[in-house]
Amino acid sequence: YDFTNCDFQKIEADYLRTISKDLITYMSGTKSTDFNNTVSCSNRPHCLTEIQSLTFNPTPRCASLAKEMFARKTKATLALWCPGYSETQINATQAMKKARKSKVTTNKCLEQVSQLLGLWRRFIRTLLKKQ
């Protein structure tokens, strides 16, 4: 999906209002210095591309993020503010259904969510730079 035509201001507002709080809740008990951020993003479409991939693509070390509250809200936000996004997400929905039902938060999932927080923060910063 090409995120170029999204309403970035509306996505920022949704992130600051709800998604960020859910991510921080997920990370509760860990320090920001516990994990080294190894990925970043260049501009707003790039940030959303990587956020979407990291949130919804199960990885061998962390298969369950797609079922978390922040992931559901991310999906709703992208569907709302990115034209045509919903139609591209049939595969992602299947991935969510296949994701483990276990609610165990592994260290690797915490690390992945730490990376996500970094990508979202970069998204906000690139937005501020453009204004």
Partner: antibody
Amino acid sequence: QVQLQESGPGLVKPSETLSLTCAVSGYSISSGYGWSWIRQPPGKGLEWIGYISYYGSISYNPSLKSRVTISRDTSKNQFSLKLSSVTAADTAVYYCARTNLLYFDSWGQGTLVTVSS
Amino acid sequence: EIVLTQSPATLSLSPGERATLSCRASQSVSNNLAWYQQKPGQAPRLLIYDASSRATGIPARFSGSGSGTDFTLTISSLEPEDFAVYYCQQYSDWPQYTFGQGTKVEIK
């Protein structure tokens, strides 16, 4: 200390597919970062080809997108480049590199691929 | 596509002298710029990222400055091992990351 090592044929015929592999040691490619390919024609500058991230997202240089495929094999801790329909203009030293999806902090030593019949 | 123009193409200096290399972008890249050093037969090495942050293990004599469209790499006092080709790279314009054409720093 991460180390990267390119391998593959040094000579490819025009119109065929160039295939290279980058073996990574000292770091798991499924643990973090992105894993990128960059090339440098003899005596010329650098051109970014694309990357695959540790979680599987892939991004390509638009000028090469129609001909490029980057994939990975996490069990062997390596990633690969395929470039189809090559011409003499694809003759270059091909580097693999670790990236944070922005810039490139560790590089392989490079492998020269010549396109010639 | 953002075009990066490096100048001069060649810089002839003696060890101990100060080197000032320029990289100009065809449009603003904010501070999304990196510098690399490449010696003959070797891979490039990251020197500077985010326009002014030194990469791990890079000596303090290397410094980067600039924002927007004009950037400078300064080598405060050239060591014999610093004679090489230097490239700038912008990462503001995903998915079209581009490099400059390079500046060769040679011994006078």
